[in-house]
Amino acid sequence: IWELKKDVYVVELDWYPDAPGEMVVLTCDTPEEDGITWTLDQSSEVLGSGKTLTIQVKEFGDAGQYTCHKGGEVLSHSLLLLHKKEDGIWSTDILKDQKEPKNKTFLRCEAKNYSGRFTCWWLTTISTDLTFSVKSSRGSSDPQGVTCGAATLSAERVRGDNKEYEYSVECQEDSACPAAEESLPIEVMVDAVHKLKYENYTSSFFIRDIIKPDPPKNLQLKPLKNSRQVEVSWEYPDTWSTPHSYFSLTFCVQVQGKSKREKKDRVFADKTSATVICRKNASISVRAQDRYYSSSWSEWASVPCSGSGSSRGGSGSGGSGGGGSKLRAVPGGSSPAWTQCQQLSQKLCTLAWSAHPLVGHMDLREEGDEETTNDVPHIQCGDGCDPQGLRDNSQFCLQRIHQGLIFYEKLLGSDIFTGEPSLLPDSPVGQLHASLLGLSQLLQPEGHHWETQQIPSLSPSQPWQRLLLRFKILRSLQAFVAVAARVFAHGAATLSP
């Protein structure tokens, strides 16, 4: 038994036929010693007398609000809730399995940007006697603060004969660092109480993995003269992180009729315009995704081909360029070839994702991820890799990136990747390895040697452990190269001569 909040206790029960249950001792919160009686819920039947009451809790009939009285006056209450465990698994009766992106997904979370603000939601078919409370932190062993609001009913839907209720909560990391590479996941814990049943649900994620931008705004069509082509332009959504030269999006532009089976024109764009072929009765749709990290695509923003006006949705100007002052030449150090570094780091991003595209197929955090990812270098908040830090002095950040590149290059050449089980011959790890080396050489100033980080002894003994370690290393490499690519893109846009 444990205390959920003041005067509310959770009794954990192994749930099987003829289970002995749990013996619980309740103590009346009063200085009085005698003349105390106990009742359960609205019943006037006296269950016992004395300052303490010992009960055997076996089923929901034994749970509820126990009240101690003296002479017709209520002294204190203790609410007992049950948390069922069947075959070693805690019950999950209150929330609905959303089955996306995998089975046993009860909580789903999304973030519109890297500000540390995110929304989680869950589904239930229960309409009454239901309460939720949400807690969150960054990391679990030495948790950093995340503040969550109250969970609220956000939608009601009819699904067949049943009504489905969606609840959501907004949370904000207290000291968010948008430009840093996350090393510890956000933990979200939801306590759910339905009548006398208690359940808890948890989710663990990095903000980068739950990013889903808002749709692009201000879609505009401009027919081109003497052509079937139309120039479509749009803007970054207002909610996306700034500056856009650092937090860049990529876009997919599609022209399609009402049916998904119809033929289509599709083009990808890094700029905020593209030229497409419009057809009668078709629509032009644009969606956005983080340019350097393969998180979710936004929903589509659409405009009909027939009208050449602007789309429904946001208006306003919202800049798309880097803006701001130029980066200063680096004191006491030479400036890198920003554009070359940008191209190579973007290539690294695509290679890192083709080497390990299985996002979410293997939940690595269940395998003690905090320890492993602490062994690899991360671009942290104080490393000067944010836009302001780059403007002040890019050397700190470039040195950190260089250290990381060397570290990962050595890891990819180590027996973690060369040992059994052998990599598939079509694995892009070889190209990734060569590109890491190429970028690190571009960064290393002539006659200047930055200190490199020692590689920890991560070498596992079992092939299956090696396989797991490869996945973890590639996942953290994806995050590392995304930050590096942002740095070089911003540098190329605001520093390159």
Partner: antibody, heavy 118, light 107 residues
């Protein structure tokens, strides 16, 4: 399955015209865009243009504008490419291809060799 | 128009070895790039679309990467049936244009 069968080889004199046909089967003809791509002997591939059989919309490469006409006959699921004012450097294999996506080429015909010689 | 440049023009590789083919665009084309294989006397065949998307029925040894102006087609372990000419094609803007091709021949 989706199939494109093209007409046979042609020999033409400079200044003449040629009309190559491409018969589609295995799908609803109006559901796919149709392109024409040519390849001169020992050379690379060159895109000529596309047609949407649903509405007859076309887009031609600037190089062929004014000299090429692409048409379709939905009743026979056949596409045609006519090239006029032929020159010797028009000697090539002409391919038709079809795809639900406008900008790349999924299903190819077997090709039609057109020789322009005096 | 966008000019596509493929290198090398000819690549001599032994069976079982890795082949890396490059394609460069004269301006940034995001991931609007597709790869084709053509064997003598045959029509080309689509291998990869949008830079890295694989086609069902195409062996997994063919993989594509890149974005912007630099693209790579990798054949991880060349089989005898892979000796052919490979073309890249951009679809960023009309006119659609192809690279000059890379001939992969037996060393």
């Amino acid at each position: 399955q989706v199939q494109l069968v093209q007409s046979g080889a042609e020999v033409k004199k400079p200044g003449a015209s040629v009309k190559v046909s491409c018969k589609a089967s295995g799908y609803t003809f109006t559901d796919y865009y149709l392109h024409w791509v040519r390849q001169a002997p020992g050379q690379g591939l060159e895109w000529m243009g596309w047609i949407d059989p649903e509405n007859g919309d076309t887009e031609y490469a600037p190089k062929f504008q004014g000299r090429v006409t692409m048409t379709t006959d939905t009743s026979t699921s056949t596409a045609y490419m006519e090239l006029r004012s032929l020159r010797s450097d028009d000697t090539a294999v002409y391919y038709c291809n079809a795809n639900k996506e406008l900008r790349y080429f999924d299903v190819w015909g077997q090709g039609t060799m057109v020789t322009v010689s005096s | 128009e966008i000019v596509m440049t493929q290198s090398p023009a000819t690549l001599s590789v032994s069976p079982g070895e890795r082949a890396t083919l490059s394609c460069r665009a004269s301006q940034s084309i995001s991931i609007n790039l597709h790869w084709y294989q053509q064997k003598p006397g045959q029509a080309p065949r689509l291998l990869i679309y949008f830079a890295s998307q694989s086609i069902s029925g195409i062996p997994a040894r063919f993989s594509g990467s890149g974005s912007g102006t630099e693209f790579t087609l990798t054949i991880s372990s060349l089989q005898s049936e892979d000796f052919a000419v490979y073309y890249c094609q951009q679809s960023n803007s009309f006119p659609l244009t192809f690279g000059g091709g890379t001939k992969v021949e037996i060393k």
